[in-house]
Amino acid sequence: RKIPKVGHTFFQKPESCPPVPGGSMKLDIGIINENQRVSMSRNIESRSTSPWNYTVTWDPNRYPSEVVQAQCRNLGCINAQGKEDISMNSVPIQQETLVVRRKHQGCSVSFQLEKVLVTVGCTCVTPVIHHVQ
Amino acid sequence: GITIPRNPGCPNSEDKNFPRTVMVNLNIHNRNTNTNPKRSSDYYNRSTSPWNLHRNEDPERYPSVIWEAKCRHLGCINADGNVDYHMNSVPIQQEILVLRREPPHCPNSFRLEKILVSVGCTCVTPIVHHVA
């Protein structure tokens, strides 16, 4: 899957673009908005009717090296009495993000962009029921 | 920076950390090509905290299309199909990395950018306080 070229309908390529070898692109990994602090709702993973836990995956050959994944705690959902209701389903909600993968081939190093699917949390859904004959 | 394990036989001149700027292959390695959440599942309709998906498009960014979730209700859908306002539909937000064309409009020069997206909604039981 290649990154699409800039469409002529939007704009012409400026003269100031840096020269890039064919088949590759220049990537600055100094992240824009790196230090912005986001106020995410506290403890929603514990207060949700489809609660989840977080685990951190760490890979030194990936940038960023730390990726947090969520796992639903239950198969069913938590009802008003605090009990699991298995007539409902806790299901993962997923989102793609980009990472940079560093590959070692002998003593040379190459970099590859990779899409990673991250589970961000869980939601409670009504299952679609089929009765098998 | 991030420390990288190195082949012990390699020269020591190699930097252990990710450099600030790298040349990257144009092909993105992935098996998850379906970026339209409406096609990947119908959870957004079947959830007790259902959401609508809004298309956010920016040609200066890769991916150029990102889908943003907005919870349909303040409360959650109960067993009778009515909204229960003693519960909350809350967006699940996630910081993701995208590519921003830098300098602008350049076809093969990018910078990583961190953005906050609402991916879906979940139903939350709030802790209740009565204000004196």
Epitope: S41 | N88, P126, V128, H129
Partner: nanobody, 116 residues
Framework: DVQLVESGGGLVQPGGSLRLSCAAS????????MGWFRQAPGKEREFVAG????????EYADSVKGRFTISRDNSKNTVYLQMNSLRPEDTAVYYC?????????WGQGTLVTVSS
């Protein structure tokens, strides 16, 4: 701590109007939504109207749609409920709610009486 100051209740004739307001102060950051519930004598507390802070999305109970309008002032952390064409069945204690997603604060209530 969080404080909620409700005002605007009172006695009004059928067909008349009132405007309730509720100002949140203290640690009222990251507001999810604010709104109003009501409780009539001998009845359960019911949702009336709410407004989401992020995008001003509004929701109303069927019984008040077209008559009541909820609005907000972000800079003042204040929510308003404009109540028109009031009916005797709107008589109740109206409670302001401040919702922070995982924590919800209830005000002490303001009495609205619709009577001739």
């Amino acid at each position: 701590d969080v404080q909620l100051v409700e005002s605007g209740g009172g006695l009004v004739q059928p067909g008349g109007s009132l405007r309730l307001s509720c100002a949140a102060s203290g640690r009222a950051s990251s507001i999810n939504w604010m709104g109003w519930f009501r409780q009539a004598p001998g009845k359960e507390r019911e949702f009336v109207a709410g407004i989401r802070w992020s995008d001003a999305y509004t929701e109303y109970a069927d019984s008040v749609k077209g008559r009541f309008t909820i609005s907000r002032d972000n800079s003042k952390n204040t929510v308003y409920l404009q109540m028109n064409s009031l009916r005797p069945e709107d008589t109740a204690v109206y409670y302001c709610v401040l919702d922070l997603s995982t924590v919800r604060y209830w005000g002490q209530g303001t009495l609205v009486t619709v009577s001739s």
